[in-house]
Interface confidence: low
């Protein structure tokens, strides 16, 4: 249960809109405000992952709950609507050509979400314009059911992506992550997020910003210079929502990204990251798909240290202990091996600088008929403070251009039982990833070379 | 540090209106609930309703709905209850209070006290 | 609207004694319980809140204990300037209600 929160959401459209949606740019949001108050949430926080098959850790190794299982469950809870932010949607194996047993986990969920339309809740999809899946049919086949699709064009906008991932069911309950809405999400790729139950208020401050998108994804949408005052948050770095998830005295704020998309009152995604940085005393624990202290997808390229700048200070001037675990797979680009390397030549033990990089490889194995999958798609970050859970890749276009959101949570720990923080929790996740045989350290690695399994 | 500030006490006739005040200092206005409690002299406390500054949100108590308006001004940090109609019934010490962490009331002002009289 | 009965309306004790008030819900209220203390000249203070939380600057001799619908609040050492009224509340569900109240006086 928590605290109540600012109130505000309630006033995203008209209060006379009704649920099945009007025809304007908002979508309608239910339950109200004043019915949210009448009852106590009591909010639960679980961490959920995607373990890709043939991924065995070592036997006694803790794990999150599984993704895939954590949104059907998700989609079992949904009595009104559900709205999906996801850079691109492929729940079916046929959208990529390829014909595998993983893929019916994807397939089942689309299954599922073409049941709950059948039912009358409501699913209101934002998406990307430009896209990745561009073959796909699972957003035909939902909106032939009634689902509402809107695609939000931020290469015109922001010449970014929509890079978001992250659900809102009933205006209670959450799922953010790396994950994509696609079945290699669920079953080829390794991913990280949380679910959070019962948490209206913290629901409703998520869902302002799937109302950013949604308004933005109208025809000849423009950026505005200021967004409405509906859109503005109460809930940020400066005032996090307070409250209890399962009787632990928590604090929580969404973060967002780019700061074109950030009402006001909406931490940034940047500042939100720096923040968890800069409060770190004793470590910080970074696993992140991507690493580029530059710009990538923008040209000329360029250099933008800015997060690099904030390990290497913590790391050099409070002796805070960086660990990086950077994705390695058959995609990724080698030009970032210099910088990891870069960054682990600040490491000093005399000096008491201490700096490590590994590299994640999942082992391809018998999977190699699907592509863009066997890797590590995670996007956290944990430190003794708090927990950071991510949908952007460490580079600076998904900070300036691309929208992505961000999660903070921080426990009180001692008030239950040792090892049940979020922030323990994760930490756990992270040194069970980082002490895996998967992880190897950047001597192994020489530059340039494929991130293939040498088992 | 957090204070609420009360005027001490109103007369007023029966039938008409009274609006009384709660000035805030000490901390975000903007950011906390507003509660409004009455105690009837020698009784208990009664929740008439709450307000949140931030964006004009409020709660009523069943009861009050007709007698009570909440009402703020954030740029003076300063919360206004409204009693309209009054009748002896209404003459009570009606209290302000912020609502902190997990709604519990965690400041108090002093109390308004009103007398309904002719 | 959920009921909170106090049924001790007034209390004698000696000062050092250790005092407990009690307060039922009329159905569960899940922790959400605060207890406030009004002195003589009508000065309300938090005391406790979510059942066993103790407010900031208050004393270590009030705690608060229960759960479900039945809770009680504690003063272990009783001293000449807790001699005031205590009010439980319910913040479990709208609308907020209080206990009748429990006044406390010196034996």
């Known amino acids: 249960w928590q605290v109540r929160c600012p109130p505000t959401w309630g006033q995203v459209q008209p209060r006379d809109v009704p649920r099945s949606w009007g025809h304007g740019s908002s979508l309608a949001l239910e339950p109200l405000e004043a019915e949210v108050r009448k009852q106590r949430d009591s909010c639960q926080l679980v961490l959920v992952e995607s373990i890709p098959q043939d991924l065995p850790f070592a036997a006694g190794s803790l794990s999150a709950q599984p993704l895939g299982q954590a949104w059907l469950q998700l989609l079992d809870t949904a009595q009104e609507s559900v709205h999906v932010a996801s850079y691109y949607w492929s729940l079916t194996g046929p959208d990529i050509g390829v014909n595998d047993s993983s893929s019916q986990l994807g397939e089942a969920l689309l299954q599922k979400l073409q049941q709950l339309l059948g039912r009358n809740i409501s699913l209101a999809v934002a998406t990307s314009s430009p896209t990745l899946a561009r073959k796909s049919t699972d957003l035909q086949v939902l909106a032939a059911r009634g689902a509402q699709v809107r695609r939000v064009p931020m290469g015109r906008l922001t010449r970014g992506v929509l890079h978001s991932k992250f659900w809102v069911v009933d205006g209670r309950h959450i799922y953010m992550g790396s994950a994509n809405m696609d079945w290699r999400s669920l079953t080829q790729v390794k991913e990280l997020g949380a679910v959070i139950y019962n948490c209206s208020h913290l629901a409703q401050d998520l869902e302002k910003t799937f109302q950013t998108y949604w308004v933005l994804g109208v025809p000849k949408a423009v950026l505005p210079k200021t967004w409405p005052q509906n859109f503005s948050s109460h809930i940020n770095r400066f005032q996090p929502f307070q409250g209890l998830f399962d009787g632990v005295p928590t604090t929580a704020y969404f973060s967002a990204s780019p700061p074109a998309l950030c009402p006001q009152g909406r931490t940034p995604d940047l500042e939100a990251l720096l923040a968890v940085m800069g409060s770190a005393q004793e470590f910080i624990y970074a696993s992140v798909m991507e690493y580029f202290p530059t710009t990538r997808f923008s040209h000329p390229r360029r250099y933008w240290p800015v997060l690099d700048n904030a390990l290497r200070a913590a790391a050099f001037s409070k002796g805070v202990r960086v660990r990086l675990l950077v994705s390695c797979g058959l995609n990724t680009d080698p030009t970032m091996f210099p910088y990891l390397r870069s960054l682990q030549a600040l490491s000093n033990p005399a000096a008491n600088v201490s700096v490590d990089v590994k590299v994640f490889i999942v082992p391809v194995g018998n999977h190699s008929n699907i592509p863009f999958s066997r890797v590590n798609h995670s996007k956290f970050m944990v430190t003794e403070k708090a927990a950071y859970i991510g949908t952007s890749n460490w580079s600076e276009d998904y900070f300036s251009s691309t929208t992505g959101v961000g999660l903070v949570v921080t426990q009180s720990p001692g008030a239950q039982p040792a090892g049940a923080t979020v922030q323990e929790q994760l930490r756990q996740l992270f040194e069970r990833d980082w002490s895996s045989r998967y992880a190897v350290g950047l001597d192994g690695q020489a530059p340039g070379q494929d991130c293939v399994w040498q088992g | 540090q957090v204070q609420l500030q009360q005027p001490g006490a109103e007369l007023v006739k029966p039938g008409t209106s009274v609006k009384m005040s709660c000035k805030a200092s000490?901390?975000?206005?903007?950011?906390?609930?507003m509660h409004w409690v009455k105690q009837r002299p020698g009784q208990g406390l009664e929740w008439i309703g709450d307000i949140y500054p931030g964006s004009d949100s409020t709660n009523y108590n069943e009861k009050f709905k007709s007698k009570a308006t909440l009402t703020v001004d954030t740029s003076s940090s300063t919360a206004y209850m409204q009693l309209s109609s009054l009748t002896s019934e209404d003459s009570a010490v009606y209290y302000c209070?912020?609502?902190?962490?997990?709604?519990?009331?965690?400041?108090w002002g002093q109390g308004t006290s009103v007398t309904v009289s002719s | 609207d959920i009921q909170m009965t106090q049924t001790t309306s007034s209390l004698s004790a000696s000062l050092g004694d250790r005092v407990t008030i009690s307060c039922r819900a009329s159905q569960d209220i899940s922790n959400y319980l605060n207890w406030y203390q009004q002195k003589p000249d009508g000065t309300v203070k938090l005391l406790i809140y979510?059942?066993?939380r103790l407010h900031s600057g208050v004393p270590s001799r009030f705690s608060g204990s229960g759960s479900g619908t039945d809770y009680s609040l504690t003063i272990s050492n009783l001293e000449q300037e807790d001699i005031a009224t205590y009010f439980c509340?319910?913040?479990?569900?709208?609308?907020?209600?209080f206990g009748g109240g429990t006044k406390l006086e010196i034996k």
């Open positions: 209070a912020r609502g902190g962490w997990l709604d519990a009331m965690d400041y």
């Open positions: 000490g901390y975000t206005f903007t950011s906390y609930w």
């Open positions: 509340q319910q913040g479990n569900t709208l609308p907020w209600t």
């Open positions: 979510y059942t066993s």
